[in-house]
C-alpha cells in the first residue's frame, strides 16, 4: 500500500498556503483527486508529489495515491481542507444524476471541519426539505440524500453556520430518473385488419412507460402519420395515445401500418397489416391431403382453416356416406381461432369403425356465400384369409381367398409335415403370385383378391399355406390334406377384432 | 491496462437527442472522475463534462443546457446525452479518465454526424 | 475560437528542433499548469506532457515543456517523422471551472 506524507488522515490549512502531498509506493505510484485549479504534479520513479504554492478553498477534497500495478488494488488517502472564512462549501457537481432508490451524494465540502456541527441541507430560496427526506452529511464527501425519489428531484443548497448566521454553497440540481427497464411498452390493435372497400375503420397505437419522456408514432407504409395524441396517466405509468378513424376505407389505406415508440433506452416497435378487399370472402383450405387412410381402430382428426371477412354466420361437419346416415357428433366437432380472420376446425374421429369409412364434408357461410371442403376416409385392414379346396376344369385346386385393404399380395407355402404355419425349416416350396385376381374393389371397402394353386397330387403328409400381407399386417390359412378328404385350419392367432 | 470503448448511433437528426455511452475496462469507474471531449472535423478539442463515480457532474457552460451525463457503476459505463443537436454538434466524441484534470486515457472516439 | 491560442501550423525537418507555442490568460495558464496532447492522424489524443514539463511514463525524453506566465512552450529536441501529427495544449481555467484547450498545431515533418 503507497505511503502518503504528511502521514495524517486530515490536513488544515488557511488559503494561500503551499501545500506539499507525497505519495511513495513500491512500484509506480499516482495521485487522484477532484479537478482542481493550482495543483502541480511531478513524478520521480515510484514517488509522486502533489503541490500547490496557493491553495485555494477549491482545493478541499480527498486525495488518493494508487499503485496501479499493485494486484491488490491498493490505496492511500488524505482529506485536505483549505478553511477559507468566506467561503464554507467546496462545491465539486452542479448537477448530480441518479437513479431512483440510489443514494444522491451531493457534494458540497466543507472547507474548515470545526463548521461541522452547523451544517444543514435546504432547498434553494431557503425552502425546507420535502417530507420523508433522509439525508446524512459527511465533511468529507458531502450530503447523502438517501434512497432518492423522482419527487426529490430539485435543486439543493448546503447550509453552514458561520457567526451565528447561515452561509449558502452554490446550488446542486438533483436529477433523480425513474428506472425505466426498456423502450416504452407498445400496444397497436388490432393485429390484422380488414375491410371492404367503403367500410371504416380504427387503428389505435399506444406506448407507456414510467418516464413521460418517450416519444410516439403511427406511420403506414413508412410515411408518419400526423395524428393527434391523447396522454395520460394511471397505474404508475404515462400513457401515449393514437387514434387513426377512417370513415370510409379505400385501396390506398391498405398496406402496412407500424406503431413506434422510443425512450433513452431504446425504441420499440409493432406492426399490423391492413388489407381492403372489392366484396366478403370465404376461403377453406387444410394442410392435410383431402384423401386420407387410416388403419381401422385408430383415431384420426380432421382439420380445415378457414379465412372469412365478415365472420362465419354458420359452419358444420358432415357425413356424406356411403355406410350410414350417421352425423359426427357435435362434441367432437372444435373450432379455435387463430386470429381475427382465420379459424381452424376440428373434427376429432377416435377409434375408428367400420362404418365409418367414407366423404366428411365442412361446410362454412358468411355473406359472401357457402363454401364446402370435403375429405375421403379409406380404412386399413390386415388382411382376412381362408382356403379351400376345390376342382376346376378337372383339376385339383387350392383356392385362397384374402380380404384387406390396401389390396394384400399373396404368397403360398408348402411344407413338411401337419402345422398350423409353416416355419423355414419345414418350407418345400414357396409360390409368390404376382397378379391374384380382384374379387371386388370399391371405394372405402376391403379389397379381396383370389388366388389359384393348382396341385395335381396332394401329399398327404404336407400342409399347404396360403399367406396374404399388406402395410397394415398379414394373415394365413394352412390346408392340411387328410386321407378322409381334406382339412383346412385358419391359425389361432388370426381373431381380427377392430 | 485501462481501456474506454465509446459506442451509439453514428448518425442523428436534428433537434433529436444525441446519446453515446462509454465502457471502462481494466479498471473500475468508481475511483476517477470521466470525461467526455469532442472534436468537430479538422478543429480543436472542445471539454463537455465531467462525472464522477456518485453522478456528480459538471457541464461546459457553453452545452450545459442542453447536455446530461450520468454514470452506472454496475455495468463500468457512463454516457453522454446532448439534446436538441444541430448540424454544429457533428463531431468526434472522446470519453476519457480525468485525473486532477489530466486526460490520461482516451477511448478512440465515436463519429456522430448531425444530419436529416 | 478556443480559448488558449496556438499557431496553426509547424514543420520542421528530420533531427531539427522544434518549438510549440501556446497562449492563455491570468484564469487558465497564468495560475494553473499545463498539459500537451499529441493526436497522429485518424487517432485519438494521447497525453504526452503534464503539470507543465512532466512526461507520462513511454513519452520519450526528446519531447519537453515549460511555462512561463501566461504562456507555455512545447519543444522537441530531434524532430523524427513519427512526430508528424497534431499537438494540443491545455490549461485548467478558473473562471470554467474545467479545461480550456487550445486549437492545435499541426506539425509537419519535411
Known amino acids: 500500500i503507497p505511503v502518503i506524507e504528511p502521514s495524517v488522515p486530515e490536513l488544515v490549512v488557511k488559503p494561500g498556503a503551499t501545500v506539499t502531498l507525497r505519495c511513495v509506493g513500491n512500484g509506480s505510484v499516482e495521485w487522484d483527486g477532484p479537478p482542481s485549479p493550482h495543483w502541480t504534479l511531478y513524478s520521480d520513479g515510484s514517488s509522486s508529489i502533489l503541490s500547490t504554492n496557493n491553495a485555494t478553498f477549491q482545493n478541499t477534497g480527498t486525495y488518493r495515491c494508487t499503485e496501479p500495478g499493485d494486484p491488490l488494488g491498493g490505496s492511500a488517502a488524505i482529506h485536505l481542507y483549505v478553511k477559507d472564512p468566506a467561503r464554507p462549501w467546496n462545491v465539486l457537481a452542479q448537477e448530480v444524476v441518479v437513479f431512483e432508490d440510489q443514494d444522491a451524494l451531493l457534494p458540497c465540502l466543507l472547507t474548515d471541519p470545526v463548521l461541522e456541527a452547523g451544517v444543514s441541507l435546504v432547498r434553494v430560496r431557503g425552502r425546507p426539505l420535502m417530507r420523508h427526506t433522509n439525508y446524512s452529511f459527511s465533511p468529507w464527501h458531502g450530503f447523502t440524500i438517501h434512497r432518492a425519489k423522482f419527487i426529490q428531484s430539485q435543486d439543493y443548497q448546503c447550509s453552514a453556520l458561520m457567526g451565528g448566521r447561515k452561509v449558502m454553497s452554490i446550488s446542486i440540481r438533483l436529477k433523480v430518473q425513474k428506472v425505466i427497464p426498456g423502450p416504452p411498452a407498445l400496444t397497436l390493435v388490432p393485429a390484422e385488419l380488414v375491410r371492404i372497400r367503403g367500410e371504416a375503420a380504427q387503428i389505435v397505437c399506444s406506448a407507456s412507460s414510467v418516464d413521460v419522456n418517450f416519444d410516439v408514432f403511427l406511420q403506414h407504409n413508412n410515411t408518419k402519420l400526423a395524428i393527434p395524441q391523447q396522454s395520460d396517466f394511471h397505474n404508475n405509468r404515462y400513457q401515449k395515445v393514437l387514434t387513426l378513424n377512417l370513415d370510409q376505407v379505400d385501396f390506398q389505406h391498405a398496406g402496412n401500418y407500424s406503431c413506434v415508440a422510443s425512450n433513452v433506452q431504446g425504441k420499440h416497435s409493432t406492426s399490423m397489416f391492413f388489407r381492403v378487399v372489392e366484396s366478403a370472402y370465404l376461403n377453406l383450405s387444410s394442410e392435410q391431403n383431402l384423401i386420407q387412410e387410416v388403419t381401422v381402430g385408430e383415431g384420426l382428426n380432421l382439420k380445415v382453416m378457414v379465412e372469412a371477412y365478415p365472420g362465419l354466420q354458420g359452419f358444420n361437419w358432415t357425413y356424406l356416406g356411403p355406410f350410414s346416415d350417421h352425423q359426427p357428433e357435435p362434441k367432437l366437432a372444435n373450432a379455435t381461432t387463430k386470429d381475427t380472420y382465420r379459424h381452424t376446425f376440428t373434427l376429432s374421429l377416435p377409434r375408428l369403425k367400420p362404418s365409418e369409412a367414407g366423404r366428411y364434408s365442412f361446410l362454412a357461410r358468411n355473406p359472401g356465400g357457402w363454401r364446402a371442403l370435403t375429405f375421403e376416409l379409406t380404412l386399413r385392414y390386415p388382411p382376412e384369409v381362408s382356403v379351400i379346396w376345390t376342382f376346376i376344369n378337372g383339376s385339383g385346386t387350392l383356392l385362397c381367398a384374402a380380404s384387406g385393404y390396401p389390396q394384400p399380395n399373396v404368397t403360398w407355402l408348402q411344407c413338411s409335415g401337419h402345422t398350423d404355419r409353416c416355419d423355414e425349416a419345414q418350407v418345400l416350396q414357396v409360390w409368390d403370385d404376382p397378379y391374384p385376381e380382384v374379387l371386388s374393389q370399391e371405394p372405402f371397402h376391403k379389397v379381396t383378391v383370389q388366388s389359384l394353386l393348382t396341385v395335381e397330387t396332394l401329399e398327404h403328409n404336407q400342409t399347404y399355406e396360403c399367406r396374404a400381407h399388406n402395410s397394415v399386417g398379414s394373415g394365413s390359412w394352412a390346408f392340411i390334406p387328410i386321407s378322409a378328404g381334406a382339412h383346412t385350419h385358419p391359425p389361432d392367432e388370426f381373431l381380427f377384432t377392430p | 491496462q485501462v481501456q474506454l470503448q465509446e459506442s451509439g448511433p453514428g448518425l442523428v437528426k436534428p433537434s433529436e437527442t444525441l446519446s453515446l455511452t462509454c465502457t471502462v475496462s481494466?479498471?473500475?469507474?468508481?475511483?476517477?472522475?470521466w470525461s467526455w471531449i469532442r472534436q468537430p472535423a479538422g478543429k480543436g478539442l472542445e471539454w463537455i463534462g465531467r462525472?464522477?463515480?456518485?453522478?456528480?457532474?459538471n457541464y461546459n457552460p457553453s452545452l450545459k443546457s442542453r447536455v446530461t451525463m450520468s454514470v452506472d457503476t454496475s455495468k463500468n459505463q457512463f454516457s453522454l446525452k446532448v439534446s436538441s443537436v444541430i448540424a454544429a454538434d457533428t463531431a468526434i466524441y472522446y470519453c476519457?479518465?480525468?485525473?486532477?484534470?489530466?486526460?490520461?486515457?482516451w477511448g478512440q472516439g465515436s463519429l456522430v454526424t448531425v444530419s436529416s | 475560437q478556443s480559448v488558449l491560442t496556438q499557431p496553426p501550423s509547424a514543420s520542421g525537418t528530420p533531427g531539427q528542433r522544434f518549438t510549440i507555442s501556446c497562449s492563455g490568460s491570468?484564469?487558465?495558464?497564468?495560475?494553473?499548469?499545463v498539459n500537451w496532447y499529441q493526436q497522429l492522424p485518424g487517432t485519438a489524443p494521447k497525453l504526452l506532457i503534464y503539470?507543465?514539463?512532466q512526461r507520462p511514463s513511454g513519452v520519450p525524453d526528446r519531447f519537453s515543456g515549460s511555462k512561463s506566465g501566461t504562456s507555455a512552450s512545447l519543444a522537441s529536441s530531434g524532430l523524427q517523422s513519427e512526430d508528424e501529427a497534431d499537438y494540443y495544449c491545455?490549461?485548467?481555467?478558473?473562471?470554467?471551472?474545467?479545461?480550456?484547450f487550445g486549437g492545435g498545431t499541426k506539425l509537419t515533418v519535411l
Open positions: 476519457a479518465r480525468n485525473r486532477l484534470g489530466i486526460y490520461d486515457y
Open positions: 481494466g479498471g473500475s469507474i468508481s475511483s476517477y472522475y
Open positions: 462525472i464522477y463515480a456518485s453522478g456528480g457532474t
Open positions: 491570468s484564469s487558465n495558464i497564468g495560475s494553473n499548469t
Open positions: 503539470s507543465n514539463n
Open positions: 491545455a490549461a485548467w481555467d478558473d473562471r470554467l471551472n474545467g479545461p480550456v
